[in-house]
Interface confidence: medium
Amino acid sequence: MMTGTIETTGNISAEKGGSIILQCHLSSTTAQVTQVNWEQQDQLLAICNADLGWHISPSFKDRVAPGPGLGLTLQSLTVNDTGEYFCIYHTYPDGTYTGRIFLEVLESSVAEHGARFQIP
C-alpha cells in the first residue's frame, strides 16, 4: 500500500529573467527513493538517480541547475516557462509518487529584478 505523501512548493510566481527553485519532499513512507524525475508537461528536465547522480537534459543544461536537495533551480526565466512542473519519485517497493507545481512567470516590472544566484 502506498502511504507516502509529496509536499511541494505549490503554485508559485517569479518574474521574467529571474530564477526559481522547484522543490518537493516525499514523507510518510519508508520506501527507498531510487530516482526523481523533473518534468515540464511532457518534457524531461532532469533526473536525479540514487546511484548515478544528476542528469540535466541537454536542451535545458544552460538554464537548469540541480538542487537544493532533490529540488531543481530554473534560471533566466521566460514567459514560456509558465506551466505545470512535476516531480516524479520512483520508489521501492511503493512505486511512483508525483507532485505538481504550477509556475507563473510574470513580465518584469523592474530590470534589476532579474538577479542571478548560485547553489554552492
Epitope: N11, S13, S27
Partner: nanobody
Framework: EVQLVESGGGLVQPGGSLRLSCAAS????????MGWFRQAPGKEREWVAS???????WYADSVKGRFTISADNSKNTAYLQMNSLKPEDTAVYYC????????WGQGTLVTVSS
C-alpha cells in the same frame, strides 16, 4: 506587489549567534516555501537554506549544523538562526518567499569580526 523585509543583522564576534527575520507581505501565492540567500562583497548571491511549509529543510554544506531555518506561515515570516558564526559568514542576507526570487528585499547585513 510582494514586499520582503529582512531584519536582525548586525556585528557579532566569531562563534557568536544572530537570529534573522523576514516578513513577507503583499500579493503573492501561498506556496509555503521560504528561503535565505546571502551575498558577500564581490561575490555572487548564493543559496543558504530553504524550508517548506511542512517543516522540511535544506541547507548549503557551508552552514549545515550551524544554521537553522524555520517559517511561521500564518505570519508570512521566515527565520534564520545562525550559531557558531565565522568571518566567512559575513554578507548581506536576503530572504525569498514561494520559490520566486524576485523582487529581492533590501537584505540585512551580518558582519562577523573580532
Amino acid at each position: 506587489e510582494v514586499q520582503l523585509v529582512e531584519s536582525g543583522g548586525g556585528l557579532v564576534q566569531p562563534g557568536g549567534s544572530l537570529r534573522l527575520s523576514c516578513a513577507a507581505s503583499g500579493n503573492t501565492f501561498s506556496g509555503g516555501f521560504m528561503g535565505w540567500f546571502r551575498q558577500a562583497p564581490g561575490k555572487e548571491r548564493e543559496w543558504v537554506a530553504s524550508v517548506l511549509r511542512g517543516g522540511y529543510t535544506w541547507y548549503a554544506d557551508s552552514v549545515k549544523g550551524r544554521f537553522t531555518i524555520s517559517a511561521d506561515n500564518s505570519k508570512n515570516t521566515a527565520y534564520l538562526q545562525m550559531n557558531s558564526l565565522k568571518p566567512e559568514d559575513t554578507a548581506v542576507y536576503y530572504c525569498t518567499r514561494d520559490g520566486g526570487f524576485d523582487p529581492w528585499g533590501q537584505g540585512t547585513l551580518v558582519t562577523v569580526s573580532s
